[in-house]
Interface confidence: low
């Protein structure tokens, strides 16, 4: 299995609205690991079921 995430550089620390930035392994593009209560590509959606 290829892991989805690698570490982000410091330049992208503000990329995720409610989460921690990671980089896509196969792509030079940031992605997010969301904090509890949030979902979405940039953790932009409040998870009403959390």
């Amino acid at each position: 299995v290829v892991s989805h995430f690698n570490d982000c550089p410091d330049s992208h620390t503000q990329f995720c609205f409610h989460g921690t930035c990671r980089f896509l392994v196969q792509e030079d593009k940031p992605a997010c690991v969301c904090h509890s209560g949030y979902v979405g590509a940039r953790c932009e959606h409040a998870d009403l079921l959390a």
């Epitope: 030079d28 979902v39 979405g40 009403l48």
Partner: antibody, heavy 116, light 107 residues
Framework: VQLQESGPGLAKPSQTLSLTCSVT????????WNWIRKFPGNKLEYMGY???????YYNPSLKSRISITRDTSKNQYYLQLNSVTTEDTATYYC???????????WGQGTTLTVSS | DILMTQSPATLSVTPGETVSLSCRAS??????LHWYQQKSHGTPKLLIK???APISGIPSRFTGSGSGTDYTLSINSVKPEDEGIYYC?????????FGGGTKLEIK
Amino acid sequence: VQLQESGPGLAKPSQTLSLTCSVTGYSITSDYWNWIRKFPGNKLEYMGYISYSGSTYYNPSLKSRISITRDTSKNQYYLQLNSVTTEDTATYYCARSYDGICFDNWGQGTTLTVSS
Amino acid sequence: DILMTQSPATLSVTPGETVSLSCRASQNTYKNLHWYQQKSHGTPKLLIKYASAPISGIPSRFTGSGSGTDYTLSINSVKPEDEGIYYCLQGYSMPWTFGGGTKLEIK
């Protein structure tokens, strides 16, 4: 965003499959542009993408046979699958994803039958 | 690859019933789980993204829940037009993988 697949419909074993996805209403220099196929029996398989920057990801199960390319001047992207067999008989879809993951716009699909 | 298992394979319900479709992942997908509907001779349509986030234009009777490895798509008060095949898709670990689908039949 509208996506439309086109292709031959029929191929013989060992031939190379070439499909085109024509995109209207949105530039392929943004987001991710994917190929997905649906086999008889309804199983879906993710094949790969070409991104906004032109970089690609291929499903390792296909890596030795697949190529995804694009022509930004035509706003089209392409799937090439080498050495097809009857196991490649499927409906092939192109699809957009804004984040590389979530497919929110799909084409109508084009059916390929591989038969001798 | 992450294996996605959907159950039941087929579900036959009467209009007005509420149904739950299950999707189980072989490892944690951290809510990177999306639901699609495909009607007969149609194209897949995104219903729910990131386990529970609603999609604009999708009726509110479709709701998603779950986390970790276990996810559920619920359809409240099923309508005849809901007939089709429902797929889950994990978007946590490449390659992205789909479940085998649940075929929803309306009596």
